[in-house]
Amino acid sequence: HLYPGEVCPGMDIRNNLTRLHELENCSVIEGHLQILLMFKTRPEDFRDLSFPKLIMITDYLLLFRVYGLESLKDLFPNLTVIRGSRLFFNYALVIFEMVHLKELGLYNLMNITRGSVRIEKNNELCYLATIDWSRILDSVEDNYIVLNKDDNEECGDICPGTAKGKTNCPATVINGQFVERCWTHSHCQKVCPTICKSHGCTAEGLCCHSECLGNCSQPDDPTKCVACRNFYLDGRCVETCPPPYYHFQDWRCVNFSFCQDLHHKCKNSRRQGCHQYVIHNNKCIPECPSGYTMNSSNLLCTPCLGPCPKVCHLLEGEKTIDSVTSAQELRGCTVINGSLIINIRGGNNLAAELEANLGLIEEISGYLKIRRSYALVSLSFFRKLRLIRGETLEIGNYSFYALDNQNLRQLWDWSKHNLTITQGKLFFHYNPKLCLSEIHKMEEVSGTKGRQERNDIALKTNGDQASCENELLKFSYIRTSFDKILLRWEPYWPPDFRDLLGFMLFYKEAPYQNVTEFDGQDACGSNSWTVVDIDPPLRSNDPKSQNHPGWLMRGLKPWTQYAIFVKTLVTFSDERRTYGAKSDIIYVQTDATNPSVPLDPISVSNSSSQIILKWKPPSDPNGNITHYLVFWERQAEDSELFELDYCLKGLKLPSRTWSPPFESEDSQKHNQSEYEDSAGECCSCPKTDSQILKELEESSFRKTFEDYLHNVVFVPRKTSSGTGAEDPRPS
C-alpha cells in the first residue's frame, strides 16, 4: 500500500506531453517535477491523462505556462505530500502563468513539509479562497497567492452539496469566519483533528500513526501510511533507519550495497555532475562534508587531521575547466594529480563560483594552462595554489601557460600570495590587459626568473591594451538623443604617432555615479563594460587643427544614465615603455522618448454601466510619464457567464473601495484618476512611508522571482532525458 509504484528521478517535462508518460508508474518523484512551456496543448489532450500512483514529490512541483490544462484533479488525484527538501525560490508548489487552469484540484494534497506556495498570474484560477493552507503547511504567511481570477471576486466557488443546500465539506476558521473547505465543486478538502498534526487521519477523523504523513488507510499502524513522516523501510514508516540501513535523500532507508552501487556507477561513468555517494552519520550522501575525507574501503567519511587532503586524479592526466559545472567536479580537491587547462569564456558569478570549487587546490603535479579565458580578470580564485610541480609539461616545456586571455588584468596579489613552480618555464602571449610588470613579478615570486627564453614572454602582445602608464584624456564634446550619444575627446599622440593603434571606448548603464573601471570580478558580469574599438583620427601636422577623435554610440536605452570612459590602444616602443592615456569616467543620460505599453491591465465592473480599469506603469517609461490613453470597443458576450448560477454563492458586488490585486506605488503615481464618489468630496489618503516601502519591496520581490523563474526554466535545447535512475542526485 505504501508507495505502490516506482521511485522516479526528478523530471522536467516541457514543450509537449510526450515525456509525461514517464510518470506512469511513479509513486515517488525523488527530486522535483516541472511541467512547463506547452503552448500547443488543449484541454482534450489532458482528458485521459492520469497518474494515480503518484503519492509524493520530494522536492517541489512547478507548473508554468501549460496551455489547455484546466485542473490537476485527474492528473494527480493521489498526490499527498510535497516534501520540499529542495525548493524553487523558497517554494514547494509554484503555479505560475497557467492561463487555462480553473482550479488546483489536488484534493489529496495533505502536507507540504517544507517551503510555501506561490500561485500567481493565473487568469482563470478559482477555488483558492476555499483552501485552508494552514492544514497543509506551517509557513502560511510566506505563501504568495496573487493576480489570480480568485482575487477579483469573480469566482463562483461552490463546494460539494452547496447547490443542494447541504454542507458536505469541513469548515475551518479564517479571520474569525467559518468557511467551507474544498478543492473543486466535487472534492472537499480533507481536514483532520488538530491532535493528528500532520500525520493525517481516516475519513472518520481517527489519527494515523505518528510516523505517517498526510494520510493512511488505517489508524495507529505505521504500515498503513500513504506517506512517511520520517523514513520508509520495507513497507513501514520508521522514525530513523536502523542498522544496517542508511538514510537516503531525507525520506528512505537504503542498505550499503545500494549506496556502494551509486558510488561506483558514478565513479565508472564519465557523466559530469554525478556524485560518488559516501556514508556519513548513518546517511548515504553525495560527498563528505568539509573536514572529512572518504575511506575508500568502506565509503565512510573520516575526520581529517588538519586540512583535508583530497587528491584528485585526472583521467588522461589533464582536465579542461570550461564552465562552472566542470569546476564543480573538482570541488574540495587540494592536490591535482595531473594538469589543469582553464578555458572559461562566460558564466554567472564566475569568480565566486570558481573560488568555491577550485579555491582549495594547493598543488598541481603537472602544468597550469590559462587559454582563451575571456571571462577571467584575475587568477585569485586559485586562493590556496602554492605549488606547480611541472612533472608533466606543456609542449615547449612550459609549466605555466597563459595565451589569449583578453581580460586578464591580474595574476595574483603578489603581496599576499606565494607560488612556487618547481620545473618548467612561463609562457605569456596575447594577454592584452596584463601588464609586463605583473608577469615579471611572477617570475621573481615563483622562482622561474632566468628560465624563460626570448619569445616565451611576448613584449608586444601582453599589456598592449593595458593602461600601465597613463596621461589624462579629456572629453571635448558631448551630445545626446534618446538612443544615441555623440562623444569627442582631445587628441592624443604618443611620441611616435604610429604607436597609436586607436582608442577603446568603454560604456555601460550606470543608475548611480559610483562606477569604477574594474567593477565586476570577471569579464562576464552584468556590470561589465561594453567596449568599442575606434581607429585613430587622421593626423594633421598643424597642432591647432588636430581632428578630435570621437564616436557615435547607437542603440542605447532612452532616459538611461551611462558611465563612459575612453583609453588609448598603443603598441610597445623599443624601450619597453608603454605610452597611453585614459579619461576619467563620465556620466551621460540619454533623452526621453515614447514609453512601452502599460502592463497587466485589470478591469472589473462595479455596476451595470461602469467598468473600472487599472493597470501598472510600463516596464520602460523612457522618461517621466504624464498621461495615458485608454481605448475601448464593445465585444461579444461569453456564454459561460450566463451558465453559472451566481445566486448559489451569494456573490457581492465590488464596493466603491475596490482595488486590484496590486497597488504599487508606481500605479498610484502614474494613475491619478482616483474613483471618487459622485459628490467628489472624498479622495484616497496619501500612503504612509511604510506602505510605500512595503509596496516597493513587494514589487521588487515579484521581479526577483520572475527573473529567477526565467533563468531556471529557459535553458538551451539539449538532447537528454531527465536525471537517470542511476544518478539520484539533487535534481
Partner: antibody, heavy 118, light 108 residues
Framework: EVQLVESGGGVVQPGGSLRLSCAAS????????MHWVRQAPGKGLEWVSL????????YYADSVKGRFTISRDNSKNSLYLQMNSLRAEDTALYYC???????????WGQGTLVTVSS | EIVLTQSPGTLSLSPGERATLSCRAS???????LAWYQQKPGQAPRLLIY???SRATGVPDRFSGSGYGTDFSLTISRLELEDFAVYYC?????????FGQGTRLEIK
C-alpha cells in the same frame, strides 16, 4: 484480550500529591496513544489527559493543566498520571483508557478512586 | 474549549421504541469529529459511534449516528432492554477533547 488495570488511588488532603499507574496488556502498548478520563461520583465523564505512543506529545484539560503530568514507560507497558496540588473537585474515579486513532477510546480500565478531602 | 450540550437530560421510553439523543456543540466542528459512548451503572464506558456515523466493532446496527457542524444525534431504532444506560457524546476536533454531560435513557 486487552486489559487495563489502574492503581495508586486513595485519600489525599487538598494540596497533596498522588501518582496513578496503569498496567496494560493484551496489545502492543507502544503502538497506541493513551488517555486518562475521570468521573466524579454521580456525574458525567471528564477527559483529563492524553499521551502519544512515544510520549512525545501530551495534552491536558484546562482544569488540570500545570498540576497534572501524564507519562508512560513503554518498556514496562505502563501509563502514569502524576497529580500535584490536588483540590476537592479532583475527587473522581480515574479511568486509564486505550486510544484508537489517538482521539477516541476503544478500551477502558475499571478505574481507581481518588478522594481529595481534609 | 468546545462545550457539548446533550438533550434531553433524561429520556424515558419503552423497549421497541425509537430513541433520538441530541448533542450540540458550542462551536462548529470542522468535520464530523464526534463519538458516542454508552455507560451502564458500575461499568466503564463503551465506544458506540465515531466520526459521527461510523459504528465501532461489535455495535448492533440499530445504533446510528448523524450530524454535522454543531448538531449531532444518536438514534436507536428499536430499543432493547440492554440499551437503557447513560450516553455521552465526545468531540475530538480540537486538542482539548471534551465530553457532553450525558443523557440518561431510562425505561418508561
Amino acid at each position: 484480550e486487552v486489559q487495563l488495570v489502574e492503581s495508586g488511588g486513595g485519600v489525599v488532603q487538598p494540596g497533596g500529591s498522588l501518582r496513578l499507574s496503569c498496567a496494560a496488556s493484551g496489545f502492543t502498548f507502544d503502538d497506541y496513544a493513551m488517555h486518562w478520563v475521570r468521573q466524579a461520583p454521580g456525574k458525567g465523564l471528564e477527559w483529563v489527559s492524553l499521551i502519544s505512543w512515544d510520549g512525545g506529545s501530551t495534552y491536558y484539560a484546562d482544569s488540570v493543566k500545570g498540576r497534572f503530568t501524564i507519562s508512560r514507560d513503554n518498556s514496562k507497558n505502563s501509563l502514569y498520571l502524576q497529580m500535584n496540588s490536588l483540590r476537592a473537585e479532583d475527587t473522581a474515579l480515574y479511568y486509564c483508557a486505550k486510544a484508537r486513532g489517538v482521539v477516541i477510546i476503544d478500551y477502558w480500565g475499571q478505574g481507581t478512586l481518588v478522594t481529595v478531602s481534609s | 474549549e468546545i462545550v457539548l450540550t446533550q438533550s434531553p437530560g433524561t429520556l424515558s421510553l419503552s423497549p421497541g421504541e425509537r430513541a433520538t439523543l441530541s448533542c450540540r456543540a458550542s462551536q462548529s466542528l470542522s468535520s464530523s469529529f464526534l463519538a458516542w459512548y454508552q455507560q451502564k451503572p458500575g461499568q466503564a464506558p463503551r465506544l458506540l459511534i465515531y466520526g459521527a456515523g461510523s459504528r465501532a466493532t461489535g455495535v448492533p446496527d440499530r445504533f446510528s449516528g448523524s450530524g454535522y457542524g454543531t448538531d449531532f444525534s444518536l438514534t436507536i431504532s428499536r430499543l432493547e432492554l440492554e440499551d437503557f444506560a447513560v450516553y455521552y457524546c465526545q468531540q475530538y476536533d480540537r486538542s482539548q477533547i471534551t465530553f457532553g454531560q450525558g443523557t440518561r435513557l431510562e425505561i418508561k
